[in-house]
């Protein structure tokens, strides 16, 4: 999915008012500073592809977030302001129900999140602090 | 508006136990907050002693480790700081303080704080 | 631990004119997210300390306009840009970047 005609005005404001409380919930009182960014982000589009990839897609030692009231909140805002989003994630979705497994929060997940998080930062503060 | 108020005894005996409350108002003990025990010798600089977590996770100086303990207590709102075998160098003001997070779960900046408790070590 | 050096740790200014404190690590406060992990908080004479600037310039909510943070890595710097009589007290720089969080010595800004 082409990000780039996304309202990123509207999507920040998402994060900012619920999907950030949800990470750090999430977290759980883990610092940003217990772990090093390796994921970064060039711009707003490649910011939320990035973001979509991490929060949705299955990694090791993480299986999945995405049922996580945080991914879920996320979900719900790039449907709503992506124009064709939502259809593009139909059959994702239904792979995602069949590989559904016991909820464990794994320092590998923190982690992820931890780097969620940073590129969250990256998306609402493109021209700062540029790489 | 979130307020923190220490108590406790301010004298205590060499070789005792300091123990300090911070009750909270305002906030829950139980959000996605580090509270913390921070103090000031008299006329000198500040020393961060600790922090906590609701979890019960806890972060201490290494310098004061062997001596420190802080606990939360969630039923009233509160976390202590319990600070053993003291002497006249623990004599300060301590500060508990909270480190709330911003939108990026950065911690490690303490906006509000207590008044302060002034505790004499001496018999 | 991380020991953070502050100077000058005397600073007499004159309303209304600048003042500048400088605040340095024994060791980077660069997280690999490129924010700097650094407070600065001022103690009024006979109060509780109060956060002025985090991540090394953000502004700590109702803070005036003319507090501001600048520097990266091992150097930091506090300007103040008109001083007025109420910003008396003592300044404290205080890295954030890993337990034990330490502070400076502090810097006692008097009016002259």
């Known amino acids: 999915y082409d990000f780039t005609n996304c309202d990123f005005e509207k999507i920040k404001a998402a994060y900012l008012s619920t999907i950030s409380k949800d990470l750090i919930t999430y977290m759980s009182g883990t610092k940003s500073t217990e772990f090093n960014n390796t994921v970064s982000c060039s711009n707003r589009p490649h910011c939320l592809t990035e973001i979509q990839s991490l929060t949705f897609n299955p990694t090791a030692g993480c299986a999945s977030l995405a049922k996580e009231m945080f991914a879920m909140k996320t979900k719900a805002a790039l449907a709503i302001w992506c124009p064709g989003y939502s259809e593009t994630q139909i059959n994702a979705t239904q792979a995602m129900k069949k590989r559904r497994k016991r909820k464990v929060t794994t320092n590998k997940c923190l982690e992820q999140v931890s780097q969620l998080q940073g590129l969250w930062r990256r998306f609402n503060r493109p021209l700062l602090k540029q790489q | 508006q979130v307020q923190l108020q220490e108590s406790g005894p301010g004298l205590v005996k060499p070789s005792g136990t300091l123990s300090l409350t911070c009750a909270v108002s305002?906030?829950?003990?139980?959000?996605?907050?580090?509270w913390n025990w921070v103090r000031q010798p008299p006329g000198k600089g500040l020393q961060w002693i600790g922090e906590?977590?609701?979890?019960?996770?806890?972060n201490y100086n290494p310098s004061l480790k062997s001596r420190v303990t802080i606990s939360v207590d969630m039923s009233k709102n509160q976390f202590s700081l319990k600070l053993s075998s003291v002497t006249a160098a623990d004599t300060a003001v301590y500060f508990c303080?909270?480190?709330?997070?911003?939108?990026?779960?950065?911690?490690?900046?303490?906006?509000?704080w207590g008044q302060g408790i002034l505790v004499t070590v001496s018999s | 631990d991380i020991v953070m050096t502050q100077s000058p740790l005397s600073l007499p200014v004159t309303p209304g004119e600048p003042a500048s404190i400088s605040c340095r690590s024994s060791?980077?406060?660069?997280?690999?997210?490129?924010?700097?992990?650094l407070d600065w908080y001022l103690q009024k004479p006979g109060q509780s300390p109060q956060l002025l600037i985090y991540?090394?310039?953000d502004r700590a909510s109702g803070v005036p306009d003319r507090f501001s943070g600048s520097g990266s890595g091992t150097d930091f710097t506090l300007k103040i840009s008109r001083v007025e009589a109420e910003d008396v007290g003592i300044y404290y720089c205080m890295q954030a970047l890993q337990t034990p969080y330490t502070f400076g010595q502090g810097t006692k800004l008097e009016i002259k």
């Open positions: 060791q980077s406060l660069l997280h690999s997210n490129e924010y700097n992990y």
């Open positions: 305002g906030d829950s003990i139980s959000s996605d907050n580090w």
């Open positions: 906590i977590f609701h979890s019960g996770r806890t």
């Open positions: 991540l090394g310039s």
């Open positions: 303080a909270r480190d709330a997070p911003n939108d990026y779960g950065d911690y490690g900046f303490f906006d509000y």
